[in-house]
């Protein structure tokens, strides 16, 4: 099975115990390391901090000692924009410019591949969007003629039904991807005005339209059913939890919310706590598990944050393994407790090394 | 192997311009940042400017900001710094470096800027 | 700006001595610290990046620590080649700033 693992770049501006560095990272862990992200500046992809090479070097050094360690470089992300990547994909100049630039700028950085992070394409991108992953497999092939073993391909892909339904044709990229990243993460936000855990296995039972759809298992049929093997679906499972601020004596899920959580220490963003983060807030914190979507979910004083557990992440394991999906994907290997000193096991990255576990079981 | 070599130092006038090349070879110039440094007689370093491989994002130095720009050509290996209005103070070796991230992991031997009437 | 205050500015010292140049950033850098030698006449040489590796070709003698605003350049055993100018450089933000320079002199 592949363990395919973010990295993201700017957790090297966090804070203290928070800020973590690509020569931290555990080199057997994964089968395959994604950094987050690159841009593309005059067509062209680019580093998108000035010191990303240097940490580019780190991150590939950790081949040295494992050879069977895959590195790839992701373009696009939240930051960059959907009509960037748009005005690229559509033009044919532009698309080509910026496929050409790929090959020579992995090599030299010595990654593996490249990741397509298009968050998301739109109505009138589906098009370009497979288009653009086809002629980069072809540019990949060709670079690859002079006995050079062939740069990978993947894409990362929304697990919401009307961005699936809307942004990608499912059996066209899927020819040319050699693996695809599903992102069943973030199901659930603040906007609901309700309690709710962004990464459920399983639909709730409370769960109507549209949140029928709103769960993992959801998700990965569809795109099954949509023309995706499941020999190249990898599923995403979020080292990270979704926190909300409860507006009521209500702590359950459904339960009325006036905003996202409180920014943790080290992540600094409303709404968003780390797993490392987690740890500490469990501390006095009340646990419960949501049974039928086989996640947990947390409350202390007026504070609710959905999370994953290495309980919950065995579930998912055993799911994506009933299914014979390619494996599994992690966002992201700085949001679990990379240093091993928060969640009290003495153990480094616990999540993704039990999904690493999991995943190896027979 | 790594080499820069920098030209188009020489002798200028306050006011006047130059234009500074660095011939890069030994690493694929087109993915890499460059950078300018330079170091006035018998003193320390000081950055000058910043451009990304692709081009697209450029720095400065506030001491030259508005009157110096760097610029590359991929195709030809090479980086510029046209240095305009000049000033007695920039009066310096001028390194081309290529970038390590955000370090200089290679210099060239430098050029000599010297402006005085 | 973020200033960069080396010290000292100019040591004397013997071939085998432990060498210790300390650098201090007037904020917080993360571990954004690179250390330089130079020698008279030459271009400067990159040593150590990101406060604590060891760059390539670069001698285990020369070692980097800190992280936050206070940074050590250490050599563990000075060698003759050993003595030149060592400067640091802030790597957090632009402008990047460079330390003013501690001159290793023989003793």
């Known amino acids: 099975y592949k363990l395919v693992c973010y990295y993201t770049s700017w957790s090297q501006y966090r804070e203290g115990d928070g800020s973590c560095f690509p020569d931290a990272l555990d080199r057997f862990l994964c089968t395959h390391i994604i950094y987050s992200f690159a841009n593309i500046s005059n067509d062209h992809i680019d580093t998108w901090e000035w010191n990303d090479v240097t940490l580019y070097g780190m991150l590939n050094t950790l081949k040295n000692r494992n050879p069977n360690l895959k590195t790839l470089l992701s373009v696009g992300g939240w930051n960059f924009g959907s009509q960037r990547f748009s005005k690229i994909a559509s033009n044919t100049q532009s698309r080509r410019t910026f496929i050409k630039s790929v090959p020579p700028f992995l090599r030299t950085h010595g990654f593996d591949g490249l990741d397509l992070a298009w968050l998301y394409p739109g109505r009138r991108d589906k098009q370009h969007f497979t288009t653009l992953i086809k002629e980069m497999k072809a540019e990949f092939i060709k670079e690859a003629q002079p006995g050079k073993k062939q740069l990978l391909l993947s894409a990362a892909l929304s697990a919401g039904k009307v961005t699936i339904d809307s942004s990608y044709d499912i059996a066209k990229i899927s020819q040319h991807l050699d693996f695809i990243s599903i992102m069943t993460y973030d199901f659930h936000g603040a906007w609901r005005g309700t309690t709710g855990h962004h990464s459920p296995l399983f639909r709730g039972q409370e769960d109507a339209s549209p949140d029928r759809f709103s769960n993992t298992d959801y998700a990965v049929g569809y795109m099954l059913r949509l023309g995706a093997p499941a020999s190249k679906l990898v599923m995403g499972i979020p080292t990270f939890g979704r926190s909300f601020t409860l507006a009521s004596s209500e702590t359950g899920v459904g339960a009325p919310i006036s905003g996202p959580g409180i920014p943790g220490r080290f992540t600094k963003e409303a709404g968003t706590l780390a797993y490392y983060e987690i740890c500490d807030f469990l501390r006095g914190a009340t646990v419960h598990r949501i049974l039928g979507q086989q996640v947990p979910y947390a409350t202390k004083g007026n504070q609710w944050v959905g999370y994953d557990d290495q309980e919950s992440v065995k579930s998912k394991v055993q799911y994506l393994k009933d299914r014979q999906l390619a494996g599994a994907m992690v966002w992201a290997l700085d949001l679990d407790d990379f240093q091993g000193s928060f969640c009290g096991q003495d153990l480094r990255f616990p999540l993704t090394n039990a999904i690493k576990d999991a995943l190896a079981a027979t | 192997e790594v080499q820069l070599v920098e030209s188009g130092g020489g002798l200028a006038q306050p006011g006047g311009s130059l234009r500074l090349s660095c011939a890069a070879s030994?690493?694929?110039?087109?993915?890499?940042?460059m950078h300018w440094v330079r170091q006035a007689p018998g003193k320390g370093l000081e950055w000058v400017s910043s451009?990304?491989?692709?081009?697209?994002?450029?720095n400065y130095a506030d001491s030259v900001k508005g009157r110096f720009t760097i610029s590359r050509d991929n195709s030809k290996n090479t980086l510029y710094l046209q240095m305009n209005s000049l000033r007695a103070e920039d009066t310096a070796v001028y390194y081309c470096?290529?970038?390590?991230?955000?370090?200089?992991?290679?210099w060239g031997q430098g050029t000599l800027v010297t402006v005085s009437s | 700006d973020i200033q960069m205050t080396q010290s000292p500015s100019s040591l004397s010292a013997s071939v085998g001595d432990r060498v210790t140049i300390t650098c201090r950033a007037s904020?917080?850098?993360?571990?954004?610290l690179n250390w330089y030698q130079q020698k008279p006449g030459k271009a400067p040489k990159l040593l150590i990046y990101a406060a604590s590796r060891l760059q390539s070709g670069v001698p285990s003698r020369f070692s980097g620590s800190g992280s936050g605003t206070d940074f050590t350049l250490t050599i563990s055993s000075l060698q003759p080649e050993d003595f030149a100018t060592y400067y640091c450089q802030q790597a957090y933000s632009f402008p990047w700033t460079f330390g003013q320079g501690t001159k290793v002199e023989i003793k």
């Open positions: 904020q917080d850098i993360s571990s954004w």
């Open positions: 470096a290529k970038g390590y991230g955000a370090s200089f992991d290679f």
């Open positions: 451009i990304k491989s692709s081009g697209g994002s450029k």
């Open positions: 030994g690493f694929t110039f087109s993915s890499y940042a």
